[in-house]
Every structure is written in C-alpha cells, then in structure tokens.
Interface confidence: low
C-alpha cells in the first residue's frame, strides 16, 4: 500500500504569452498521495469550477482559456491540497498578447506643391507596434522633408511633384505584420507659364501668332486678353501633352495691341493664375512712337459711350500699363467724385472730358491724339459752366482743393490749339455746337479770347453729373 | 467606454512624497503610454512624463528628473506617479493622460489635487 | 528645450471668428495638437496632428500649421467656446512633450 505522500509541483507554472481570442493553457503537474485537489486563482481570486470561459481538465492540473481576453491579464496560480503536509502554490502570468491592427488607416489625398501633407496610420497592438511606410514598392526613406511621426503618420512637408505616387504603411511587432491599403497622394502644382508670348513689330494687316504654353497639375486652361478685354477677333488653338498646355493666337492686325495669355487651374475651391504678356506694334507707326507714347482703338468703355461717335477710334496712352482700363477708372473716378451743377453745366462738362481723356486718333496715320480745340474748351469754362468754374477757382485760391488737381483729366484750355488755324489739328466737341442763341442767360465773364473764337453752341440732352472741383480746374 | 479614474485629493508637508494612481478602463491598458502632466492654480499645463505599461519604460521632463518616479501595475491597468520632496511650488492638479494611437491626448484622467502645507 | 509661445488672451464677439496662434521654431515641421479646457476641467482635445478634429469635436474647429506659427480657428464662435486653449508638440529630439503657454478666449 502506498505511504501518503505531501502534493509537490514538479512543473511551476510559467509565464504564458497569448494572443486575443486564442487559447491559453497553464499546466500545473502534481505529484501526490492521494490525489491532490486543486484548485485555480486570478490575480488572488479563486477561479470558479463553472465558469464557461475556463476549462480545468487532468484532475484540475490544466487550466485553458478558451479565448482570451485583454482583461485576462494577470497572475494565475495553482494550489495543491492532499490533506498530508500543507498546500502548495506555483504562480505564473498571463501576458496577452496583440498582433498589430491598424485602427486609422491612411486615406487618399490631393495636395498642392509646396504645402504639407500627412498620412495618418494609427495602430494598436501589444509589444506598441513599430510603423514603417512603403512608396511604391520600396521602403520611404525618411530626411528633411519626409518623417513618420511618433503617432505612426507619414508627415512630407514642402510636397513636391515626385512625391505623387501610392502608399502604405506597415504596422509590425514581435507577433506579426499588418499592412494598410495602398493610398493615393495627388500633388497638385499651381498654373505656370513655360513660355510666354512674345512681342512682335509688325505691317499693318499682316497676321501674327501669339504662342504661350502653361503647365499646372490640373492641366490648366489658357484664356486671352486684348488691351484689357477678352480677345474678339483671332483664332485659337489648342493642344495638350503631358501636364503642358500649347495656345496659339492668330490674329489680323489692323492696331497695336497688348495681349495678355492667362492661364488657370483649379485646386479644389480655389483657382491659382498665371499671366505673361506681348505687345503687337505697327512698323510704320513706330518712327513717331517716341512723340506718341500709345495706339489707336475702338471706345469698349461705359462711361463715355454716350459722348464719343459710334466706332470712332481713340487714343490710349501706354505709359499706362494698362491704357483703356487706366483711362476708365480715370473717368469713372472724376464722375463718382462730381457733385452736382447745374443741367446747363452737365452735359458740356460730359463732352469736354471724355473727348479730352479719349482722343480722336485715326489709322493709318502716326498714333498722335487729336486734342479739343481751344474754343470748344472756353465754351465750356466761359459760358457753360462759368458759375461753377468761378466757384471752383475761388475755393482753389483759399487752398481748399490744392491736393490732387492736377491728376483731374481735364485740359488747360489755353495750350489747346485753335480751330481757325488748322481745323483738321483738333476735336470739335459736336455736343456744343448749336447757336448760342439758345442760352437764356450768358455770364459776364471776360473772356481770355475774342468771343468771335466762341463757336455757336447746340444744347445738349446728355446728363452726366460734373462737380466743379473736377470739371473746370 | 475608455475611462482614467484617479485617486483623491492628497495634503502633504513639504519634504514628503504623494503617490497618485490612474486606473484605466475600456482598453488595453499595456497598449498605450501613459502621461503625467500637472497644473498649479492659475497655470498653465506642465507635462511630467511617461511610462510604456507594457515594458515599464520611462522619460521624464529634466524639470522632474530624480524626484518622480512612474509605476505601473498591469494587473489591475493602473499606473502611478510619485513625486518627492515636495515644496509649496508642487501645490497643484495631476492629470493622467493617454493617447490611443494618436501622439495626442484624447483621453484625460478627471484630475488629483495636491496641496503642500506646512 | 522647445518653446511654444501663444497669446495670453483672445477676444471675440459671438458668431465671429477667433484665431489663436502658436509660435515655435520651425513648428511646421512638428505635429501640433490643441486643448481646450473649461475651469475646474480636464483638458480636451479639439485638434491634434495640425488640423484633425476628434470624433465630437464641431466642425467649427479647424487649425493649420507652417513655417514657424500654428493656428487654431474658431469659427462661428459660441458663448461655450469661451475658455483656455493650449497648443502641444512631441519634441523628437528629447523625446519630450511641450505645452504652449496658453491662451484665455473670452466671448464677448
């Protein structure tokens, strides 16, 4: 008959690694007599028999469960009980364990050159994941520019071009790899002009071709623009290769132009522009140019459109960068500034200005203004608009109107050259010629001419409103 | 539902050491670092440091170097900051804090305060 | 050791827009993330890795980050948006955790 014997652990429980959702088995060999009973602890608290998430088989000396959990962490012992010499205990642990899973993987982006751009790639496991990123089919290489961030983002700052291309990042620990999806990052790069269009000197009615070539990520568009406004005679072609647009302008020149190549792409709501530009000369009409710093073209304005003769060409000065939109904002500042005269003052004030900011000039002839003729400018100062002249001059005197009157676009009626020495050398203003008769009340004002130079005057049904300040200086 | 519960409000005598504990809830708590970051009256945030749970791997702010100490205890997901040799100037509140996969915070523990008083 | 300067106070009447600026050597270079917390509170996370909101987090809480200024841009501010603000950055050098100095938003 065998003697009692006290129970004795011959294998100690062991520290056990185990991933979530498999099993875990601790083995606790007892040698005994009689057969020990045993029984299991957590972490000092007794393991139940009936517990279905455990399974205790061999006699109670295996303890399997059956699939762990982040919370069956901890210590787990064993204690052996034969009624002979005390009970005894071999504790181990429980270490769960966690293959990496990737929790916030990255997304695809678009990006503009030059900005910074972040992949997020957030991972959970146990050992802490290391994240590494892969471009392409190779490992990202960390510099400057480009870092994987403690939080396992990929952080490219100053994104360039060759930064485009499809990424992933890896999530690895000692229990294994886990890979995100491959992500697209779009660098978008703003509209740039690769070869402007270039200036030409050419013959009257000769034909040109304006070539201005952008690129951009989104390809660009190409628009154009002549003196200002959208090109309104010419052909356009277009082509597109590789990112790189190609626009060609055919034009039939009949007048000196500044043409304007704007090229344009979107980056989501915003727009990002470019611009070069090319001037188109007439070669006959250069030998005077030094004299007659502008060209000859068709009023495309508002606030004259009323005054000047239906398609007749005016001057445009290109000592403005640029002239027609220069010489409107001119006029439409002298009439927002105009306070009101009298209607008699109104329309003279209206004719006289806009024929003196927008001068007759024809083709075919050097581009020199053709500037009001001086009686037509007494008229307005001397008889139409003589009270508010008056006024104006008076309050110039007390120093009231010192700051800027020299940039009113209004001309010095004495240096303006008189029609009876060469009618052809100067503007007639056809508002103001009507029989002066028609004038119910003529100031008495000393005229610096002889009122025969006074023309005979007609009334006028325009109504633009002139403030002294601005029409008679 | 994640949570970091800390333990209450402590008075202590300069000179001496406070323990304060962060247990945490609803997550692997050997998953994630843990941060230490205190605030005095008035003041702004000042972090401390961490401690890796799982390998019981500190850093610690130069500020703090040699009088505190991060513990952790990864049987029950609680860790544990001690500061010694306290002075009036540690008077302030002590927050846990972890970030779950992010290098930011997102989850806070509701603050300890501790006073230093003679 | 990093340093990150923010404005002591910011104020914004209702339904305006609030900016609070975060200054460090090359931040853009750095994640940034910001805080918000009420008095008696624990801090919040409104924006981390320069312009992520957390789940729960309104839209009308956005930020950026360059060169040497991050921003947090509270849009269409409300009276609850009133509170302290701190910016934060993991030093990769030291391995360290920094905190801006904080800034106060009072709504008006």
């Known amino acids: 008959e065998k003697l009692p014997k006290a129970p004795v652990i011959t294998t100690p429980l062991e520290t056990v690694d185990a991933l979530v959702e498999e099993v875990a088995t601790f083995m606790c060999a007892v040698e005994s007599y009689p057969q020990p009973e045993i029984s299991w602890t957590r972490n000092k608290i007794l393991i139940k028999l009936f517990d279905t998430r455990y399974s205790i088989r061999e006699n109670g000396q295996l303890l399997t469960i059956l699939s762990v959990e982040d919370s069956d962490d901890g210590i787990y012992c064993c204690i052996a009980n034969n009624g002979v010499g005390g009970a005894v205990e071999s504790c181990g642990a429980l270490q769960v364990k966690m293959k990496p899973k990737i929790t916030r993987p990255p997304i695809n982006v678009k990006i503009i050159e030059g900005l910074k751009a972040v992949l997020p790639c957030t991972t959970m496991g146990n050992p802490k994941p290391s994240v590494s990123w892969i471009k392409g089919d190779n490992a990202l290489r960390e510099n400057s520019r480009i870092a994987v961030l403690e939080s396992g983002s990929l952080r490219i700052h100053n994104v360039q071009k060759e930064d485009a291309g499809q990424y992933r990042c890896v999530a690895k620990n000692s229990l294994g790899t886990a890979y995100s999806k491959l992500v697209k990052l779009e660098v978008e790069v703003f509209a740039r002009i690769l070869r402007a269009p270039e200036s030409h000197n050419v013959t009257f009615g000769s034909f040109v071709t304006l070539r201005c070539t952008a690129i951009g990520i989104p390809v660009p568009t190409i628009s154009w623009i002549e003196n200002g406004n959208a090109v309104s005679s010419g052909s356009i072609q277009e082509s597109v290769k590789d990112r790189v647009i190609d626009s060609r302008l055919q034009l039939f020149i009949t007048k000196p132009g500044l043409y304007t190549c704007i090229a344009t792409n979107k980056h989501g709501e915003k727009f990002s522009t470019a611009k070069a530009a090319a001037t188109v000369s007439i070669a006959e009409w250069s030998k005077s140019q030094k004299d007659s710093q502008g060209y000859c073209a068709q009023y495309r304005g508002e606030v004259c459109d009323a005054v000047l003769a239906k398609d007749a060409l005016v001057f445009f000065n290109t000592s403005y960068r640029d002239p027609e939109d220069a010489q409107e904002l001119l006029i439409h500042t002298a009439w927002n500034e105009l306070k009101a005269v009298s209607p008699l003052c109104r329309p003279a004030a209206e004719a006289l200005l806009c024929n003196h900011l927008f001068q007759e000039c024809s083709p075919g002839v050097v581009p020199t203004p053709m500037p009001i003729c001086r009686e037509y400018c007494l008229a307005v100062k001397e008889l139409f608009c003589a009270k508010e002249w008056q006024a104006m001059e008076g309050k110039a005197h007390r120093g009231l109107y010192r700051s800027g009157m020299h940039l009113l676009p209004v001309p010095e009626c004495s240096k303006l050259p008189s029609m009876h020495r060469d009618p052809t050398a100067c503007t007639r203003l056809p508002y103001l010629d009507y029989k002066k008769e028609n004038i119910t009340t003529f100031p008495s004002i000393t005229s610096s001419r002889p009122s025969a130079d006074i023309p005979n005057l007609p009334a006028s049904t325009s109504s633009f409103a002139v403030s002294p300040a601005y029409s008679m200086t | 539902q994640v949570h970091l519960v800390q333990s209450g409000a402590e008075v202590k005598k300069p000179g001496a050491s406070v323990k304060v504990s962060c247990k945490a809830s609803g997550y692997t708590f050997t998953g994630y670092y843990m941060h230490w970051v205190r605030q005095a009256p008035g003041q702004g945030l000042e972090w401390m440091g961490w401690i890796n749970p799982y390998s019981g791997g500190t850093s610690y702010a130069q500020k703090f170097q040699g009088r505190v100490t991060m513990t952790r205890d990864t049987s029950i997901s609680t860790a544990y900051m001690e500061l010694s040799r306290l002075i009036s100037d540690d008077t302030a509140v002590y927050y846990c804090?972890?970030?779950?996969?992010?290098?930011?915070?997102?989850?806070w523990g509701q603050g300890t305060m501790v006073t230093v008083s003679s | 050791s990093y340093v990150l300067t923010q404005p002591p106070s910011v104020s914004v009447a209702p339904g305006q827009t609030a900016r609070i600026t975060c200054g460090g050597n090359n931040i853009g270079s750095k994640s940034v993330h910001w805080y918000q917390q009420k008095p008696g509170q624990a801090p919040v996370l409104v924006v981390y890795d320069d312009s992520d909101r957390p789940s729960g987090i309104p839209e009308r809480f956005s930020g950026s980050n360059s060169g040497n200024t991050a921003t947090l841009t509270i849009s269409r501010v409300e009276a609850g948006d009133e509170a302290d603000y701190y910016c934060?950055?993991?030093?990769?050098?030291?391995?360290?955790?920094?905190f801006g100095t904080g800034t106060k938003v009072t709504v008006l």
């Open positions: 804090a972890s970030g779950l996969g992010i290098s930011a915070f997102d989850i």
């Open positions: 934060q950055v993991w030093d990769r050098s030291s391995d360290h955790y920094v």
